[in-house]
């Protein structure tokens, strides 16, 4: 995770700040998962593509007391504060599968690490 | 401890401009949404603007036009910028951290304020 | 814009009372079961403060006295034995549909 960005060096804050924020946090999540996440609590998948900060909001703002991922909530509302318009993303509810928070969490990681090496941090 | 400091407040005439800034501590700035609320004197609370991490901006139609919510990560700063002021700008404005729309506006700074008058 | 109405616009009470504030919404303010209503303490000359999100959820930090509900258009925010400290005035808020809008205020008074 140390290589995600210079934590070390001083200057102006890169635009990948607030992409490698979320991944730390996520990587806290799964590394401090000792009972199931969430007490097991499933959630949707959703398209890890446009829209994607939104919709991982959305799947995940029904998991309701698990304090766990709370700070991921709000990290993720930085990216979309506010509601998105109906149609905007279509994918946002796209409802067919669900997953545990945990993979949830895991799949989602990955994802973001991903875009972190490609340089996309928007 | 969260903490949020407005200052660039004062008296402007009808039709002036002026810059307000926020000072943040406290939480990784970058990593969330903010925003402007305005008061007028004596009265209830007003959403003026919104900008993402990613900044993107967000105005209610009252100011949208005139005034240009903006950041500064490397500063941990926020700003808006108004234009074009009336008597109706008159007001206390506070910056706030928007934790989004399922949060609400999580912190408030005490305010600074804004005077609209020849 | 969706308006919001707050009732009543001040009230007398007493410390150790039970406290009710109603909001009420011109149109739903509900998103796929989530009601979008959040709920603010302001004293005099000081910052508005942050007691619920999402209708009833209990901000960090906030007594356990205050609690809210509702959902839709009709909601509630309810101080369960009124302490010094709570005399201030509330405000209920939308973020179900820009422009946010807040409700006009309900100043609770020293009886």
């Known amino acids: 995770l140390t290589c995600l960005g210079g934590f070390a060096s001083p200057g102006p804050v890169p635009p990948s700040t607030a992409l490698r924020e979320l991944i730390e946090e996520l990587v806290n999540i799964t590394q401090n998962q000792k009972a199931p996440l969430c007490n097991g609590s499933m959630v949707w998948s959703i398209n890890l593509t446009a829209g994607m900060y939104c919709a991982a909001l959305e799947s995940l703002i029904n998991v309701s007391g698990c304090s766990a991922i709370e700070k991921t909530q709000r990290m993720l509302s930085g990216f979309c504060p506010h509601k998105v318009s109906a149609g905007q993303f279509s994918s946002l509810h796209v409802r067919d599968t669900k997953i545990e928070v945990a993979q949830f969490v895991k799949d989602l990681l990955l994802h973001l690490k991903k875009l972190f090496r490609e340089g996309q941090f928007n | 401890e969260v903490k949020l400091v407005e200052s660039g407040g004062g008296l402007v005439q009808p039709g002036g401009s002026l810059r307000l800034s926020c000072a943040a501590s406290?939480?990784?700035?970058?990593?969330?949404?903010m925003s402007w609320v305005r008061q007028a004197p004596g009265k209830g609370l007003e959403w003026v603007a919104s900008?993402?991490?990613?900044?993107?901006?967000y105005y209610p139609d009252s100011v949208k036009g005139r005034f240009t919510i903006s950041r500064d990560n490397a500063k941990n700063s926020l700003y808006l910028q108004m234009n074009s002021l009336r008597a109706e700008d008159t007001a206390v404005y506070y910056c706030?951290?928007?934790?989004?729309?399922?949060?609400?506006?999580?912190?408030w700074g005490q305010g600074t304020l804004v005077t609209v008058s020849s | 814009d969706i308006q919001l109405t707050q009732s009543p616009s001040s009230l007398s009470a007493s410390v150790g009372d039970r406290v009710t504030i109603t909001c009420k919404a011109s149109?739903?303010?509900?998103?796929?079961?989530?009601?979008?209503m959040h709920w603010y303490q302001q004293k005099p000359g000081k910052a508005p403060k942050l007691l619920i999100y999402?209708?009833?959820n209990l901000e960090s930090g906030v007594p356990s006295r205050f609690s809210g509900s509702g959902s839709r258009t009709d909601f509630t925010l309810t101080i369960s034995s009124l302490q010094p400290e709570d005399f201030a005035t509330y405000y209920c808020?939308?973020?179900?549909?820009?422009?946010?809008?807040f409700g006009g205020g309900t100043k609770v008074e020293i009886k």
């Open positions: 706030a951290r928007l934790d989004g729309y399922y949060f609400g506006f999580a912190y």
């Open positions: 406290g939480f990784t700035f970058i990593s969330y949404a």
């Open positions: 900008i993402s991490s990613g900044g993107n901006t």
């Open positions: 149109e739903s303010v509900d998103n796929y079961g989530k009601s979008l």
């Open positions: 999402r209708a009833s």
């Open positions: 808020q939308q973020s179900n549909e820009d422009p946010w809008t």
